[in-house]
């Protein structure tokens, strides 16, 4: 799925109302120093196509994340507020029924979180080039992280 | 519990540099950006910049592009913001601080390192 | 660069009482709005982010509202330890912007 047509400032506003805080609560009791981010994304539409993957993709050692209240919460913002995007994950959902039942949250599964927020953070605020063109809103789809 | 600890008072002259340093502990550091902000004596807030420690973007305000260059040191986690080609209106209280867990505020700030610029 | 305009630049409140700052920005911020308060001889402290969202800690008697380019500040009760500088930011676009400070003193 393109997330370039995507309602940004709608989903930050629901990532900022609820979602956020459901992340919180899922990471709670870990150390904030325990976990590196090495997942980055450069734009918003880029921070969304590996928030998805993240969130709605079973790994290894983690195959339960869908099922969290942050990750139905982000299903129902996108299919909102990105056009078409409810019509792609017909597949994805069957596939995610036949992921295992039970919510089990493993150090894998925080690790996953970890980043999460990370991406999250970034969408939120992406880190654009200088400023004439830096308008969170509209053009940060159109550039790229500016390397001193 | 997160802190940010920056250096010393410098005292500059007129066209030389300083680089002020900002110590990070209680949370990865390479997971949060550090903004740079200054203060004039009895003025406002004023925003210089922002590096990302992770990978070492960076954005700067266009009043100081040129003259300010921010890095950071993973492996000591700590930030640093130089300035350059020093003047008696660069006389101020540095501050770094820790973008907030959702990335739209500053959250835990330094406690300021004076910079006095003077012949 | 997005002006961010503060009002008063200082008011003087009667311990109890309510207080409102009014920022408004020179162009739409949509709700990338934040709110710190420096109290005298220290860092400035996050208090309000994202318009209306408390940070933690930070009591109740902090609102704040708004959206697009007019937002506020209120204090349903001010207290002793409010006194200081209240600055609002916007975080919407680069370079980031503070206004110029509204200064808080108790009666």
């Known amino acids: 799925y393109d997330f370039t047509n995507c309602d940004f400032e709608k989903i930050k506003a629901a990532y900022l109302s609820t979602i956020s805080k459901d992340l919180i609560t899922y990471m709670s009791g870990t150390k904030s120093t325990e976990f590196n981010n090495t997942v980055s994304c450069s734009n918003r539409p880029h921070c969304l196509t590996e928030i998805q993957s993240l969130t709605f993709n079973p790994t290894a050692g983690c195959a339960s994340l869908a099922k969290e209240m942050f990750a139905m919460k982000t299903k129902a913002a996108l299919a909102i507020w990105c056009p078409g995007y409810s019509e792609t994950q017909i597949n994805a959902t069957q596939a995610m029924k036949k992921a295992r039942k039970s919510k089990v949250t493993t150090n894998k599964c925080l690790e996953q979180v970890s980043q999460l927020q990370g991406l999250w953070r970034r969408f939120n605020r992406p880190l654009l080039k200088q400023q004439g063109s830096s308008d969170y809103k509209d053009d940060d789809d159109k550039h790229h992280h500016h390397h001193h | 519990e997160v802190q940010l600890v920056q250096s010393g008072a410098e005292v500059k002259k007129p066209g030389s540099s300083v680089k002020v340093s900002c110590k990070a502990s209680g949370y990865a550091f390479s997971n949060y950006l550090i903004e740079w902000v200054r203060q004039a004596p009895g003025q406002g807030l004023e925003w210089i910049g922002v590096?990302?420690?992770?990978?070492?973007?960076?954005n700067y305000n266009e009043n100081f592009k040129g003259r300010a260059t921010l890095t950071a040191d993973k492996s000591t986690s700590t930030a640093y913001m130089e300035l350059s080609s020093l003047r008696s209106e660069d006389t101020a209280v540095y501050y770094c601080a820790r973008e907030d867990n959702t990335g739209t505020a500053f959250d835990y700030w330094g406690q300021g390192t004076t910079v006095t610029v003077s012949s | 660069s997005i002006v961010m305009t503060q009002t008063p630049l200082s008011l003087s409140v009667t311990p109890g009482q309510p207080a409102s700052i009014s920022c408004k920005a020179s162009?739409?911020?949509?709700?990338?709005v934040t709110w710190y308060l420096q109290k005298p001889g220290q860092s400035p402290q996050l208090l309000i982010y994202y318009v209306s969202n408390h940070y933690t800690g930070v009591p109740d008697r902090f609102s704040g509202s708004g959206s697009g380019t007019d937002f506020t500040l209120k204090i349903s009760r001010v207290e002793a330890e409010d006194v200081g500088v209240y600055y609002c930011q916007q975080h919407h676009r680069f370079p980031l912007t503070f206004g110029q400070g509204t200064k808080l003193e108790i009666k």
């Open positions: 590096i990302d420690p992770g990978n070492g973007d960076t």
């Open positions: 162009q739409s911020v949509s709700s990338d």
